[in-house]
Amino acid sequence: TIPPHVQKSVNNDMIVTDNNGAVKFPQLCKFCDVRFSTCDNQKSCMSNCSITSICEKPQEVCVAVWRKNDENITLETVCHDPKLPYHDFILEDAASPKCIMKEKKKPGETFFMCSCSSDECNDNIIFSEEYNTSNPDLLLVIFQ
């Protein structure tokens, strides 16, 4: 629970608690913003980001964004609050322990995004269908 000597200030989004009233500690995420990437046509890639950051707010999760256009491929790694859209998209998979890339519609480029909530989970980005729980065969295995 929140220690009694830690003041609760008004509108304080820096003190976040879970359902049991325990203080929620912040996530550690890879945070290199946008970098050029060689990740292409692979089942999974490492971010090659050497910066692990303490997310500023405890509710933030790790995010990775992979983009490919005619000129280059980039990978973006950040912390972000899942209550807020990122690149105009909702972070649907924020509670996932793994960063499973999902394609989003963006004109003029190929755009994949994932979010996750385990330490440095956006270091390993996964494109492979076998990890995607929208795959009915995988759901069958899970529920058997």
Epitope: A22, V23, F25, L28, T52, I54
Partner: nanobody, 119 residues
């Protein structure tokens, strides 16, 4: 009984240095991540720095990177925060905290030590 006892706070001039200590007892100190967290008057918690159980991996908030250094001595059950190039905005109560881990499911907090940076 679990205890985390911070010390080393005080009044320091801008540009000065302080070293905070946090003496731990009542739990397996080397198991899990430890944090320094601060709270400026009337503000929320700011997560300053963290260190893994073995001490090899350390993490810092952007606001203190390059100025603060976290370390731990597991043989002495003590966590440290070396604070250099202190600024007025570093004024706060500094808490050490142990994050819950798989082997230790509760988090623990110290009572805090006040750091005041003023000329």
């Amino acid at each position: 009984e679990v205890q985390l006892l911070e010390s080393g706070g005080g009044l320091v001039q801008p540009g000065g240095s302080l070293r905070l200590s946090c003496a731990a007892s009542g739990f397996t100190f080397g198991d899990g991540r430890m944090w320094w967290v601060r709270q400026a008057p009337g503000k929320g918690l700011e997560w300053v720095s963290a260190i893994e159980g073995a001490g090899s991996d350390t993490y810092y908030a952007d606001s203190v990177k390059g100025r603060f250094t976290i370390s731990r001595d597991n043989s002495k059950n003590t966590l440290y925060l070396q604070m250099n190039s202190l600024r007025a905005e570093d004024t706060a109560v500094y808490y050490c905290a142990k994050q819950a881990s798989r082997n230790s499911p509760f988090d623990y907090w110290g009572q805090g030590t006040l750091v005041t940076v003023s000329s």
